[in-house]
Interface confidence: low
């Protein structure tokens, strides 16, 4: 480690004095100190002498001697005070720039250590420091404002009490720069735009940042637009706004518009699409099939997507029959806006009743006219079955009627004993009727089919069962011949409540 002579940490001299600082090391040595006049440097191998014959207050400062060849980077320092009764301060820099939350050193060096007790930091024009300014003082280095804030960007002066009066330093301007977190924040309004040819339009591109140094521009299909910029400082942010006003749009104005802002941290951009159309439009669509089948008692939501410009002037859901003249309750109709020109309309049909099957139409109107989209809702029912004994063309016949939707399939079973329902162990014979006769098949109604089983002689200790099933469920009816006549009944479990 180099050694400085005189071997004291501080040296106090008067203006005009001769000062000689000698540094000796193992190898070559170098001096480092505040830039000040009148110093002469003599180097001689492993020693270096810094001297002046006329010390001034500007020589006040810390002088450090280093040995560049020393791998440990050792150094020695001495602080020189040149105590000038007229000049209590030596200001090393008149402008200090730091980022927010860094410590800011205002380098006003005290020229006389005796004055330390009476020093203070003030703002120019005799103003006190802002409240909550946290600072400390070192006679060797000056005042340090800790964790400086942007609002502390001020002109400061160091004050010392000399003979009962305050003597100020020249001013030091502190610039506290905002830490820029990234590229400017951007907004481009609207996110999408549609206009009819000849209408007016406005597109607003705005950017904001904590720092004023950023650029913003609006481009149309990669062409930068020349638009006057409005600037403001609001809520501690700088804002720059570009407003494109089009009095009468035409097809050449359509296309992609990009708002681009950049600063030292990088670039942000956001885009929107402007569509120019010849006339008003209204398009209805649905992601659902327009033909819907739902089991009775269940619920269904019908959804219609609407794309329109200008906006809708009216819309409603209508039930077109064929059953009652009821209309959908308004509370079950819901509208949601996906964006400016696209909307979704939903009709909720909970716990569907038989009378609610049929056609549901969504109608919408805008200056482009009326449009409608119609759903056909068919209800699914499990089969209902009944069996009767009759004579057809002189032959004894069991007649089974099954009603449901979709169309039920029919199976006949003959089993031993008297029972409400044939089980596998009792079954003697099974007949599938591949083509039952369709008695009725109207839209939105149940399909009723009829199946005939010709029986030459009824066995009295046997049961004949007609079973019908479809995708929703099944139903059955057992026929038990009795000597006094035929007896028929459905199984106990057949109860249908929609």
């Amino acid at each position: 480690i180099p050694v400085i002579e005189p071997s004291v940490p501080e040296l106090v001299v008067k203006p005009g004095a001769t000062v000689t600082l000698r540094c000796v090391g193992n190898g070559s040595v170098e001096w480092d100190g505040p830039p000040s006049p009148h110093w002469t440097l003599y180097s001689d191998g492993s020693s270096s002498i810094l001297s002046t014959n006329n010390a001034t207050f500007q020589n006040t400062g810390t002088y450090r001697c280093t040995e560049p060849g020393d791998p440990l980077g050792g150094s020695a320092a001495i602080h020189l005070y040149v105590k000038d009764p007229a000049r209590p301060w030596n200001v090393l820099a008149q402008e200090v720039v730091v980022f927010e939350d860094q410590d800011a050193l205002l380098p006003c060096l005290l020229t006389d250590p005796v004055l330390e007790a009476g020093v203070s930091l003030v703002r120019v024009r005799g103003r006190p420091l802002m409240r909550h300014t946290n600072y400390s003082f070192s006679p060797w280095h000056g005042f340090t404002i800790h964790r400086a804030k942007f609002i502390q960007s001020q002109d400061y002066q160091c004050s010392a009490l000399m003979g009962g009066r305050k003597v100020m330093s020249i001013s030091i301007r502190l610039k506290v720069q905002k830490v820029i977190p990234g590229p400017p924040a951007l907004t481009l309004v609207p996110a999408e735009l549609v206009r009819i040819r000849g209408e007016a339009a406005q597109i607003v591109c705005s950017a904001s940042s904590v720092d004023v140094n950023f650029d913003v521009f609006l481009q149309h299909n990669n062409t930068k637009l020349a638009i006057p910029q409005q600037s403001d400082f609001h809520n501690n942010r700088y804002q720059k706004v570009l407003t494109l006003n089009l009095d009468q749009v035409d097809f050449q104005h359509a296309g992609n518009y990009s708002c681009v802002a950049s600063n030292v941290q990088g670039k942000h951009s956001t885009s929107m699409f402007f569509r120019v159309v010849e006339s008003a439009y209204l398009n209805l669509s649905s992601e659902q099939n327009l033909i819907q089948e739902v089991t009775v008692g269940e619920g269904l939501n019908l959804k219609v997507m609407v794309e329109a410009y200008p906006g809708l002037q009216g819309f409603n859901w209508t039930y077109l029959g064929p059953f009652s003249d009821h209309q959908p309750e308004p509370k079950l109709a819901n509208a949601t806006t996906k964006d400016t020109y696209r909307h979704t309309f939903t009709l909720s049909l909970p716990r569907l009743k038989p009378s609610e099957a049929g056609r549901y139409s969504f109608l919408a109107r805008n200056p482009g006219g009326w449009r409608a989209l119609t759903f056909e809702l068919t209800l699914r029912y499990p089969p209902e079955v009944s069996v009767i004994w009759t004579f057809i063309n002189g032959s004894g016949t069991l007649l089974c009627a099954a009603s449901g939707y979709p169309q039920p399939n029919v199976t006949w079973l003959q089993c031993s004993g008297h029972t409400d329902r044939c089980d596998e162990a009792q079954v003697l014979q099974v007949w599938d009727d591949p083509y039952p006769e369709v008695l009725s098949q109207e839209p939105f109604h149940k399909v009723t089919v009829q199946s005939l089983l010709t029986v030459e002689t009824l066995e009295h200790n046997q049961t004949y069962e007609c079973r019908a099933h479809n995708s929703v469920g099944s139903g059955s009816w057992a026929f038990i011949p009795i000597s006094a006549g035929a007896h028929t009944h459905p199984p106990d479990e057949f109860l249908f409540t929609p």
Partner: antibody
Framework: EVQLVESGGGLVKPGGSLRLSCAAS????????MSWVRQAPGKGLEWVGR??????????DYAAPVKGRFTISRDDSKNTLYLQMNSLKTEDTAVHYC?????????????WGQGTMVTVSS | DIVMTQSPDSLAVSLGERATINCKSS????????????LAWYQQKPGQPPKLLIF???TRDSGVPDRFSGSGSGTDFTLTISSLQAEDVAVYYC?????????FGGGTKVEIK
């Protein structure tokens, strides 16, 4: 000593023009956001407009009644603020003050000139 | 624009008594990021320019007597003169500096009863 001194006021006919000046001293003018505030006889205070420091972009803002007719500019080398008033109307008759706020106070005005009277009359 | 409404228009108070002036802004002048209200109070005596009394709604400017105090937040603010002195006879204005255009209240004339 901190000081703002306005000049250039006087009598002018409706439709005429006038240029007000404001000489600043005793503080760092180039760092200041400078405003003009006016006061019609017997009335309250009305903000006219503002110019920011060059380091803050040097942009201007105006109150609606004067927008498009008045222009604020500054010459930092001369420590002078200007208000160019065109198309003057009788309702522009007022004492016009040059004012600024300590930088940290933003636009709370702690330094005011004595004002200069502008009279618009035929 | 933010509209500043002062009340009352005029106020007569005995020497040594308390004077209270209210100011209401049409929208909040509190900036949540630094929790500061961008509101100032001024005193104007005849033939003189206005003098800043209070900034940030409640901070007295240097040299302003401590009988002057400001309070309030958001949209409702109050200037209080705790003990009226003869030299306090003046017109008092509130002003928002939250956004441009900067706007002043209509003023409150304080007189001695």
């Amino acid at each position: 000593e901190v000081q703002l001194v306005e000049s250039g006021g006087g009598l002018v006919k409706p439709g005429g023009s006038l240029r007000l000046s404001c000489a600043a001293s005793g503080f760092t003018f180039s760092n200041a956001w400078m405003s003009w505030v006016r006061q019609a006889p017997g009335k309250g205070l009305e903000w006219v407009g503002r110019i920011k420091s060059k380091t803050d972009g040097g942009t201007t803002d105006y109150a609606a009644p004067v927008k498009g007719r008045f222009t604020i500019s500054r010459d930092d080398s001369k420590n002078t603020l200007y208000l160019q008033m065109n198309s003057l109307k009788t309702e522009d008759t007022a004492v016009h003050y040059c004012t600024t706020g300590d930088y940290s106070y933003t636009d709370a005005f702690d330094i005011w000139g004595q004002g200069t009277m502008v009279t618009v009359s035929s | 624009d933010i509209v500043m409404t002062q009340s009352p228009d005029s106020l007569a108070v005995s020497l040594g008594e308390r004077a209270t002036i209210n100011c209401k802004s049409s929208q909040s002048v509190l900036y949540s990021s630094n929790n500061k209200n961008y509101l100032a109070w001024y005193q104007q005596k005849p033939g003189q320019p206005p003098k800043l009394l209070i900034f940030w709604a409640s901070t007295r400017d240097s040299g302003v007597p401590d009988r002057f105090s400001g309070s309030g937040s958001g949209t409702d603010f109050t200037l209080t003169i705790s003990s009226l002195q003869a030299e306090d006879v003046a017109v008092y204005y509130c002003q928002q500096y939250y956004s441009t255009p900067l706007t002043f209240g209509g003023g409150t004339k304080v007189e001695i009863k």
